[in-house]
């Protein structure tokens, strides 16, 4: 109600004789800050005084002094919400009912705390989760209603009296709610722990031991076996008799069920601690354990590995890898289930022994076609030898063999004709799907591995053909040896190296490219004229009139060749130079007068120069000299002289004579 | 010091059960297993099973499983054993033990005698 | 359960003499966390209960003579007393504690 003053504080704190404690408080007083505070042990109130009495163990006056005898117990508070006192150190006879005597101006209050001391220091409590399971991790937690400032503890973890590996975390709590130490301790336990001791120890701040808590371990788990065989080896012979035993060394709870594994399978109508095997087979071999089960789940021992020996069954063989490639490694292996594993083979190829082959492989590091076949094996251990199972088959593959281009023909083959080829092949694995022909052509295949070509070409040299499976094999080139008439048959300047000019030593050269055959005849013509049979045709002083067009003509046993009409231009200086007058040698004066320099010249006159009786140049430089209006002094004597790039030239005189008019004679 | 005491000597029935108590002093009662072993004349020593009396969880011989009953009273710190249809082979000295990490503690020994 | 053999089954041996007996486990008991053998030696004497001799496999208990000894690891152990006064006429058991408890069929030591 509102009339009461508010504390919060731990209910009873726990200590032990020489240690301490530390009461954490707070409050709040009706009215005003606190005026005075007494701490009582085991206060009474006395009615008559209408006081407390009691042991005063601490009590503060207005001025603030505190007698110096008050020094083992401290009020830490203050005057308005703290409380907090602290014993130290703290005595068995300290035990029982605290009173803190609070009062401000105009209230008072009376406020207990229980205070339990006990002779020695009280051990920690070990909590445990209620159920402990292998493998599952689990708080183990030591608690110990204890913790004050002005004296360290310290909680230690024992396993079978061993330190715990495993870090423990350890917390206090000094609060107005609770006042303990707590260690925590995380740890994931086998089925080994079951039983086990667990301790947890107080220890003071030097390590001293001031109390403990002990629990035993339970720690459920699933049934730990152990399999026990006769024989000890677990290796017996067909026929033999086996005991396998399963022994419980632990299982929490109790165990349910018992039953037995083969290679992971139940075995059925097995369920005691021992399996008797009578008269085994080789398929009772492999992989024995027992299980037993409880609540927790099903247990399982280590495996036993029952052999039961036998000689080789009927081998097989596995190869590495059929169809192989010529050249390439393959490895077989003699396959035949035996116990123990066979310590000597024998290797067949087509049925006949393979010498110095006694291991389970045979590796072959290049294979070639005659290793095609069949190969079979057989096993022997020491309880004997197997049968000879019925082999594999080793198919080696490879390009096609010997391939060759062959000519069809009636040789020889002349430029034009048809000719036909076929592609050849020895052998061949797997069997020639394909040709290949080398040049490519726009050529016939008629069938497979033929080919025609149609009006074989002059150039058609040699031909290859390659037969293909998975690979191509490729013939050596076939030379076609085509036949034809001469090609590119020209003619040739030989000398002079420049242009021919008149006078000059001039011969001439019949070149073709090629001819097959290589006996060739030549002819030489001029305007259709046959002028030589050489491959030169030679002029020793070359004229004018030599010059025209010639051609050669190259033959052989397959026809002849001409060539391209070759002109044969001859250079020399104007020749054959005259005047020619137009209209004529006698023209009327006032009338126009055409005087021609003719001439013959190569290359044709570039200059030409005209000259009088008195042989005075006269300033007119082209071909025609144009006299308008002619006079009679013109009369007289001409004559031109040409200039081209090779020389000069002059005419003979020629005389123009000018008469008079009539007119002119009239006026006489 | 840790003490161990049991019951006096019993004579039974084929038949009948009993129940033997072990009174435990001088150790934190909830702390330690309690072991029941039994020695029969001339024989080797056979473990019972136990009881955990912090929680009452018991653990039991195959042996012993459908006729023995093991149960402790924490506020008198008292474990007690009890075998039912006794049979004359029943016949032997029983004892509680406990270990400690570096002990073991036995209790005198409680004689049964089965017969007819 | 894990079975304890013992042997011999009895032995007779002059005062004096130092006598060896064996005890034998179906799988090993030692306990990894603390690398111990959980393997305890009784000497019990008619109408006694059993007293223990060594804990730990080779541990002496305090106040047990000192010619007492255990030894071995694992599933092979050994008590040697190594000078038999005649009040060690007694038999002597093996216990195994790793896993529940089993015991050892015990070996009777007489003086001659």
């Known amino acids: 109600d509102s009339s009461k003053w508010v504390f919060e504080h731990p209910e009873t704190l726990y200590a032990w004789e020489g240690a301490c404690v530390w009461i954490p408080c707070t409050y709040r007083a009706l009215d005003g800050d606190l005026e005075s505070f007494i701490l009582f042990h085991n206060p009474e109130y006395n009615k008559n005084t209408s006081k407390f009495d009691g042991t005063r163990l601490y009590e503060s006056t207005k001025d603030g002094k505190v007698p110096s005898e008050q020094k083992r117990v401290q009020f830490l508070g203050d005057k308005n919400k703290n409380c907090t006192l602290s014993i130290h150190p703290v005595h068995l006879n300290d035990s029982g009912q605290l009173g803190l005597r609070m009062e401000s101006k105009t209230e008072k209050w009376m406020e207990r705390i229980h205070l339990n001391v006990s002779e020695r220091p009280f051990p920690p409590h070990i909590q445990l989760p209620p159920e402990i399971q292998e493998s599952q991790e689990v708080t183990l937690t030591c608690l110990l209603n204890f913790s004050c400032y002005g004296y360290p503890i310290q909680l230690q973890w024992l396993l079978e009296g061993v330190p715990m590996r495993q870090a423990a975390v350890t917390s206090t709590s000094l609060t107005i709610k609770s006042v303990f130490t707590r260690s925590e301790l995380k740890f994931s336990p086998q089925w080994s722990h079951h039983g086990k001791i667990v301790t947890c120890q107080l220890q003071d701040a030097d390590g001293k031991f001031l109390s403990n808590d002990t629990v035993q371990l339970n720690v459920k788990h699933t049934p730990k076996l152990e399999i026990k065989v006769t024989p000890s080896d677990a290796i017996v012979r067909e026929g033999d008799s086996v005991t396998m035993t399963c022994e419980v060394s632990s299982s929490n709870p109790e165990y349910t069920t018992v039953s037995w594994l083969k290679d992971g399978t139940s075995l059925k109508k097995q369920n005691t601690f021992t399996l008797n095997l009578r008269e085994v087979t080789k398929d009772q071999s492999g992989k024995y354990c027992c299980q037993v089960s409880n609540d927790v789940g099903p247990g399982r021992s280590e495996e036993v590995f029952l052999q039961v020996q036998y000689a080789p069954e009927p081998s097989t063989v596995q190869i590495l890898h059929s169809p192989a490639v010529e050249g390439s490694q393959v490895e077989f292996l003699c396959m035949s289930l035996a116990n123990p594993l066979p310590t000597n083979y024998t290797w067949y190829h087509n049925g006949k022994e393979m010498q110095g082959r006694t291991e389970e492989k045979v590796h072959i590091p290049k294979i070639l076609p005659w290793h095609a076949g069949t190969y079979s094996c057989v096993a022997e251990n020491i309880l004997g030898t197997g049968q000879r199972g019925p082999g594999a088959e080793l198919d080696v593959q490879y390009p096609p063999k010997k391939v060759t281009t062959v000519i069809q023909n009636p040789m020889p083959i002349r430029e034009g004709d048809t000719v036909t080829l076929s592609c050849n092949y020895n052998s061949s694995n797997p069997s020639v799907t394909r040709y290949e022909w080398k040049p490519h052509g726009a050529w016939e295949e008629p069938s497979l591995g033929v080919l025609k070509i149609q009006n074989v070409g002059w150039d058609n040299t040699t031909i290859a053909c390659a037969a293909c499976n998975s690979w191509c094999s490729w013939a050596s080139p076939v030379a076609l040896n085509v036949q034809y008439a001469p090609r590119d048959v020209r003619v040739r300047k030989i000398k002079p190296l420049s242009e021919i000019h008149s006078g000059n030593s001039v011969s001439l050269q019949c070149d073709f490219s090629s001819s097959h055959p290589k006996e060739v005849q030549f002819f030489w013509e001029k305007n259709g004229r046959l002028l030589g049979k050489e491959s030169q045709l030679n002029f020793d002083s070359i004229s004018p009139e030599d010059a025209g067009s010639y051609s050669c003509w190259v033959n052989n046993s397959i026809g002849q060749t001409a060539s391209k009409a070759w002109t044969l231009e001859v250079l020399y200086a104007p020749r054959r130079l005259r005047v020619s007058m137009s209209p004529g040698d006698q023209v009327m004066e006032g009338k126009s007068a055409t005087l021609t320099c003719e001439s013959d010249a190569n290359p044709p006159v570039s200059h030409y120069t005209w000259f009088d009786w008195n042989n005075q140049s006269l300033p007119y430089h082209s071909q025609k000299l144009r006299l308008e209006p002619v006079k009679v002094q013109h009369s007289g004597a001409y004559w031109c002289q040409g200039t081209n790039s090779v020389g000069k030239g002059r005419s003979p005189l020629s005389t123009l004579t000018v008469y008079y008019s009539p007119e002119t004679i009239g006026r006489r | 010091q840790v003490q161990l005491v049991q019951s006096g000597a019993e004579v039974k029935k084929p038949g009948a059960s009993v129940k033997v108590s072990c009174k435990a002093s001088g150790y934190t009662f909830t702390s330690y297993w309690l072991h029941w072993v039994r020695q029969a004349p001339g024989q080797r020593l056979e473990w019972m099973g136990y009881?955990?009396?912090?929680?009452?969880?018991?653990e039991y011989n195959q042996n012993f499983k459908d006729r023995v009953t093991l149960t402790a009273d924490k506020s008198a710190s008292t474990a007690y054993m009890e075998l039912s249809s006794l049979r004359s082979e029943d016949t032997a000295v029983y004892y509680c033990?406990?270990?400690?990490?570096?002990?073991?503690?036995w209790g005198q020994g409680t004689t049964l005698t089965v017969s007819s | 359960d894990i079975v304890l053999t013992q042997s011999p089954d009895s032995l007779a041996v002059s005062a004096g003499e130092r006598v060896t007996m064996n005890c034998k486990s179906s799988q090993s008991v030692l306990y990894s966390a603390n690398h111990k053998n959980y393997l305890a030696w009784y000497q019990q004497k008619p109408g006694q209960p059993p007293k223990l001799l060594i804990y730990?496999?080779?541990t002496r208990e305090s106040g047990v003579p000192d010619r007492f000894s255990g030894s071995g690891s694992g599933t092979d152990f050994t008590l040697t007393i190594s000078s038999v006064q005649a009040e060690d006429v007694a038999i002597y058991y093996c216990h195994q504690y790793l896993s529940s408890w089993t015991f050892g069929g015990g070996t009777k030591l007489e003086i001659k």
């Open positions: 033990a406990r270990r400690d990490i570096t002990t073991f503690y």
């Open positions: 009881i955990n009396p912090r929680n009452d969880y018991t």
């Open positions: 730990w496999a080779s």
